[in-house]
């Protein structure tokens, strides 16, 4: 009904009132909801409402305003410090102490990050998105930079249902159907050898406690593994000889270690250097990622930042020490 | 079977040193880190000193800093604890233990040896 | 540095009770705390770690609860292989400190 100048919609009614006509919605049931729009931000409850703009937001902390899209900080947040003197001794030696293990004190240096003392560096959210790894989703944390809330928005608790079968059958050159999902890894691009590749751009490079001859004969586990916590497919790089890019890596030089073999005396033939473990090149093919999910790493320098997270969480199932995102194409770096 | 055993125990005068050596196996040596623990006689457990075998790094209890020194030799697998100036209070069963966590001193130790016995007395 | 105190220092139980031991810290560890089973002249076992985490090949009657400055360890039916001395231990900061120990003993 029209009501002067004002137009009303579908249901409702004219009501001239002392400020002038107004639509008045008499039975919710009738009128267009005003929740059809999903209005309230950040997981923020609708409610119907009979007038304009016929919904109200019930929001959750801490957002308000009429859709939930206000941030409002909380008064009583202290300002993070960190226990200087004693974070301040044990920061960068390698070992990561969980008292110093937080934002204030760059993870200990980089200790608890894999040598990365921010990786949510490029996250601009308003909340502090490291400290809402928490089993629920949080939009404002929910982009690439923010390293997709750590998976929270989208089910993260799905696991593979037949997790030991697909296991042993991944990335073996053998599509098995049962473990073509998301949450089983898509059975290693066993079944889509058929579709074009999809690179991310960029190479992770990574360092693990683990002799080279011993993590190529684990590749397969590896690779899931740390494809299962990238919601992706990753693979070894080749270099332009065809050769696998895993290299023996000797250990950093660091202060604690060049004390250490001070003390230590060489003994006859004993050898120079020992390997400590290895740098592996890989990168991310995203083919079946971007067919099932909009939550894929165009480039890998969130990736890194996503598995240092995991570090700092000690959710790795791997001896990492160290992960890089390098953009340019490397020949061997050492 | 991730394993540790540890020797070098014995009987020592006060001021005396001794060097205890725990021989690991099982498992990927460096990527783990290492504790000492000692229990006196009839006592409860104490922490000695930690160790992460990659890098070097140390930690220590202050009722032994100073006078005890943890190493590690990766070629051979096998933490040590040198232990100089020693006490009659330094009289325990010395435990090496590792830590669960990589690279983690903020882990739990979840492997232990079978401990040495060391006696300071005169 | 963190104090760790058990109580009780000792009890005495049957085949069969549930026994409850708990552990207090001087300040806050979050969840890292462990608990240790240790028989006589033997060296200590992890039973329980992160607060309430089972270590591998532990039976499910013994389970661990509480975080920041409070946690329990229960033993829902006592069996005799329990009998034996039970640490609490915290590693959330160095020095890593141990409770003074429970006896678990044979009423």
């Known amino acids: 009904s029209s009501c002067g100048q004002v137009k009303c919609r579908k249901g409702e009614q004219c009501v001239h009132t002392a400020s002038g006509p107004r639509c008045f919605c008499p039975s919710p049931r009738d009128c267009e909801s005003g929740c059809a729009s999903s209005p309230c931000q950040h997981g923020g409850s609708c409610h119907p409402q009979r007038q304009p703009p016929y919904y109200s937001c019930q929001c959750a902390p801490p957002f308000s305003g009429s859709r939930c899209e206000l941030y409002t900080a909380p008064p009583s947040t202290p300002p993070a410090t960190c226990l200087s003197q004693y974070c301040a001794d044990k920061a960068r030696d390698g070992v990561c102490d969980e008292a110093c293990n937080s934002h204030a004190c760059q993870w200990d240096g980089g200790d608890c990050s894999l040598t990365m003392e921010n990786p949510w560096a490029n996250c601009s959210s308003p909340l502090p998105c490291w400290d809402y790894i928490n089993n629920q989703c949080d939009e404002l944390c929910n982009t690439v930079e923010c390293l997709f809330d750590n998976f929270e928005c989208q089910g993260n608790s799905k696991t593979c249902k037949y997790d030991k079968y697909c296991a042993d059958h991944f990335k073996d050159n053998h599509c098995d159907q049962g473990c073509n999902s998301e949450e089983c890894g898509w059975d290693g691009l066993d079944c889509a050898a058929d579709q074009p590749e999809n690179l991310a751009e960029g190479t992770l490079v990574i360092v693990v406690l683990m002799p080279p001859e011993q993590l190529l004969q684990d590749a397969r586990s590896f690779l899931r593994a740390l494809g299962t916590l990238l919601h992706t497919n990753l693979r070894i790089k080749r270099d332009s000889q065809g050769e696998l890019m895993v290299y023996p890596y000797y250990g950093e030089k660091s202060a604690a270690m060049k004390k250490q073999r001070m003390t230590r005396r060489s003994l006859p033939g004993e050898q120079e250097q020992e390997v400590a473990g290895s740098k592996v090149f890989l990168e991310i093919d995203n083919r079946q990622c971007v067919q099932d999910s909009d939550h894929c790493f165009k480039n890998t320098d969130a990736a890194a930042a996503l598995l240092a997270s995991h570090a700092i969480q000690g959710t790795l199932s791997y001896p990492l020490v160290s992960v890089v995102s390098e953009s340019l194409t490397p020949e061997r770096t050492q | 079977e991730v394993q540790l055993v540890e020797s070098g125990g014995g009987l020592v005068q006060p001021g005396g040193s001794l060097r205890l050596s725990c021989a690991a196996s099982?498992?990927?040596?460096?990527?783990?880190?290492m504790s000492w623990v000692r229990q006196a006689p009839g006592k409860g457990l104490e922490w000695v000193s930690y160790i992460y075998p990659y890098s070097g790094a140390t930690y220590y209890a202050d009722s032994v800093k100073g006078r005890f020194t943890i190493s590690a030799d990766t070629s051979k697998n096998t933490a040590y604890l040198q232990m100089n100036s020693l006490r009659a209070e330094d009289t325990a069963v010395y435990y090496c233990?590792?830590?669960?966590?990589?690279?983690?001193?903020?882990?739990?130790?979840?492997?232990w040896g079978q401990g040495t016995l060391v006696t300071v007395s005169s | 540095d963190i104090q760790m105190t058990q109580s009780p220092s000792s009890l005495s139980a049957s085949v069969g009770d549930r026994v409850t031991i708990t552990c207090r810290a001087s300040q806050s560890n979050r969840r890292f705390l462990a608990w240790y089973q240790q028989k006589p002249g033997k060296a200590p076992k992890l039973l329980i770690y992160g607060a309430s985490r089972r270590a591998s090949g532990v039976p499910s009657r013994f389970s661990g609860s509480g975080s920041g400055t409070d946690f329990t360890l229960t033993i829902s039916s006592l069996q005799p292989e329990d009998f034996a001395t039970y640490y609490c231990?915290?590693?959330?900061?160095?020095?890593?400190?141990f409770g003074q120990g429970t006896k678990v003993e044979i009423k």
């Open positions: 233990a590792r830590h669960s966590g990589y690279y983690r001193i903020s882990s739990a130790m979840d492997v």
């Open positions: 099982g498992y990927s040596f460096t990527s783990y880190g």
């Open positions: 231990q915290q590693y959330y900061i160095s020095p890593l400190t």
